[in-house]
């Protein structure tokens, strides 16, 4: 499957289906990842206007925050994006979905922070192992999107310096037990797994021991699979436009899709005086579609030159990927040129905008 251009493809995104209303879904994302929250309508069909809220404040769409009626994407997430997110019905403010999002450090490889937590001479004559950074070990459940890197750490000390070994689901865990292997960094008391997959789910236990004793800590890893979805169109685009007769107009449509999307621009038309067919589908004509030499960038813009009154009406940006369609529509209003307005005023006529 072609992934298309970087600006459109959201790398390492976890699409999280919305929990039942009333439930709060606890989610953990890595720094730099795309947080993607999904709140499908109860019936799979339209659910009316919605708003996304973070910590009680409505989210404003931006280059980084993509707000759709059923999905929210926060690109390149950072710690500041942690918080309580909810999708609400605009009119009633009823909470449809509720998520608790935490963005943590999830380095793309296990090599940063080297040197931290290394075995150190504590000055203690002899002693059983103990945790040197227990505050770094309080997150027992880690839920990460597939393809991310996971690092489990058990910083410890003791005299003599203890050894560390790892178990998965209670059994010895070695590199040959997973495709892609593992990195054991004894100096950092860590286990690193790159590009995690669903089969990596399970309980991981570090066992730290010396001749005076043994301590252990168990972490639970959940790997969130990416779920396919229809293209996401940026909220507010295309935007309604008002133009003067003879001027040029541009409609914009920003499409985000894992799979290469098809993009088309449609104009709504009337057939035998009707705007919709017998099944309620609007009658449309295709204005712009992918051609041999058309780039996706070009398809995201519809340009209308020297507009006439016939150009007024409803326009739709239609995007489709491997599993479905998404669309956003906007209206173009064409006003008479200023000279015509002046003449009309002198004649005592009134034009409705």
């Amino acid at each position: 499957e072609s992934l298309g251009t970087e600006q459109r493809v959201v790398g390492r995104a976890a699409e999280v289906p919305g929990p039942e209303p009333g439930q709060q879904e606890q989610l953990v994302f890595g720094s730099g990842d795309a947080v993607e929250l999904s709140c499908p309508p109860p019936g799979g069909g339209p659910m009316g206007p919605t708003v996304w809220v973070k910590d009680g404040t409505g989210l404003v769409p931006s280059e980084r925050v993509l707000v759709g009626p059923q999905r929210l994407q926060v690109l390149n997430a950072s710690h500041e994006d942690s918080g309580a997110y909810s999708c609400r019905q605009r009119l009633t403010q009823r909470v449809l979905c509720h998520f608790s999002v935490r963005v943590t450090d999830a380095p793309s490889s296990g090599d940063d922070e080297d040197g931290e937590d290394e075995a150190e001479d504590t000055g203690v004559d002899t002693g059983a192992p103990y945790w040197t950074r227990p505050e770094r070990m309080d997150k027992k459940l880690l839920a990460v999107p597939a393809a991310n890197t996971v690092r489990f750490r058990c910083p410890a000390a003791g005299n003599p310096t203890p050894s560390i070994s790892w178990l998965k689901n209670g059994r010895e865990f070695r590199g040959e037990h997973r495709i892609g292997g593992i990195k054991l960094r004894h100096q950092q008391w860590s286990l690193v797994m790159e590009s995690v997959v669903p089969s990596d789910r399970g309980n991981y236990t570090c066992v730290v021991e010396n001749k005076f004793g043994s301590i252990r800590q168990t972490y639970t890893l959940d790997v969130l699979e990416r779920s396919p979805h229809r293209p996401i169109l940026q909220a507010g685009l295309p935007a309604n436009q008002t133009a003067v007769l003879g001027s040029d107009v541009e409609f914009h449509c920003k499409v985000y899709s894992d799979a290469q999307p098809h993009i088309q621009w449609l104009k709504h038309v009337e057939v035998n005086g009707s705007k919709v067919g017998p099944d309620g589908t609007p009658y449309v004509t295709v204005l712009k579609t992918a051609g041999a030499n058309t780039t996706d960038k070009e398809l995201e813009v519809l340009s209308l030159h020297n507009v006439t009154f016939e150009d007024a009406g409803e326009y739709t940006c239609l995007a489709g990927n491997s599993i479905g369609f998404s669309h956003h529509s906007a209206w173009l209003v064409v006003l008479p040129a200023e000279e015509e307005l002046v003449e009309a005023d002198e004649a005592g006529s009134v034009y409705a905008g």
């Epitope: 779920s227 067919g277 009658y283 295709v286 369609f325």
Partner: antibody, heavy 124, light 107 residues
Framework: QVQLVQSGAEVKKPGSSVKVSCKAS????????ISWVRQAPGQGLEWMGG????????NYAQKFQGRVTITADESTSTAYMELSSLRSEDTAVYYC?????????????????WGQGTLVTVSS | DIQMTQSPSSLSASVGDRVTITCRAS??????LAWYQQKPGKAPKLLIY???SLQSGVPSRFSGSGSGTDFTLTISSLQPEDFAVYYC?????????FGQGTKVEIK
């Protein structure tokens, strides 16, 4: 009332081809995705492939790749499924099914409307 | 391809019984799951989509639940017209795939 009406039963020889039609009445044909699903006698349902007329694109199941061709004629609101190199195990009822339209739920492969089925018998 | 596994493959029940059919996907499919009912010689009929949404015109005794990999179709009180074959179907991934079917027979 939107309907999908399929062509009649066919009896074919092994090695030959069959072309089944599916005409949509009472709807805006190109706005929907049309798929073909088959069911061998006493067996389950199997998706063969689908076409999205508005984009002019088709997808096929790996199993049928190279043997099946799905086309659509927007002027007559008709979809076609042609299966070549027929063998006895292709004996089945072939259904056309309508997936999501761009103004409905939008999922190409969520079928809410089916044709009545066309029995294709492959026998020497 | 995503494999859909239904259980049981057949069941016998009486009118008025509560019937549950389960479906498991070989990998997560979010809520992209539908249930179809098929009677002999007829085309399948959509009952449930988006895992739990009732298709219009379908009696409310049919309900669906689940998300991810495990899904359930429940018929709260079996009626004579409900004896049929039921298929689960995932539509969120190419190729879309059906379960092998569950035949609900009269006891």
């Amino acid at each position: 009332q939107v309907q999908l009406v399929q062509s009649g039963a066919e009896v074919k020889k092994p090695g030959s081809s069959v072309k089944v039609s599916c005409k949509a009445s009472g709807g805006t044909f190109s706005s929907y995705a049309i798929s073909w699903v088959r069911q061998a006698p006493g067996q389950g349902l199997e998706w063969m492939g689908g076409i999205i007329p508005i984009f002019g694109t088709a997808n096929y199941a790996q199993k049928f790749q190279g043997r099946v061709t799905i086309t659509a004629d927007e002027s007559t609101s008709t979809a076609y499924m042609e299966l070549s190199s027929l063998r006895s195990e292709d004996t089945a009822v072939y259904y056309c099914a309508r997936g999501g339209g761009w103004v409905s739920h939008g999922y190409y492969y969520l079928f809410d409307l089916w044709g009545q089925g066309t029995l294709v018998t492959v026998s020497s | 391809d995503i494999q859909m596994t239904q259980s049981p493959s057949s069941l016998s029940a009486s009118v008025g019984d509560r019937v549950t059919i389960t479906c498991r996907a070989s990998q997560g499919i979010s809520s992209y799951l539908a249930w179809y009912q098929q009677k002999p010689g007829k085309a399948p009929k959509l009952l449930i989509y988006a895992a739990s949404s009732l298709q219009s015109g379908v009696p409310s005794r049919f309900s669906g639940s689940g998300s991810g990999t495990d899904f359930t179709l429940t018929i709260s009180s079996l009626q004579p017209e409900d004896f049929a074959v039921y298929y689960c179907f995932q539509y969120g991934s190419i190729p879309p795939t059906f379960g092998q079917g569950t035949k609900v027979e009269i006891k």
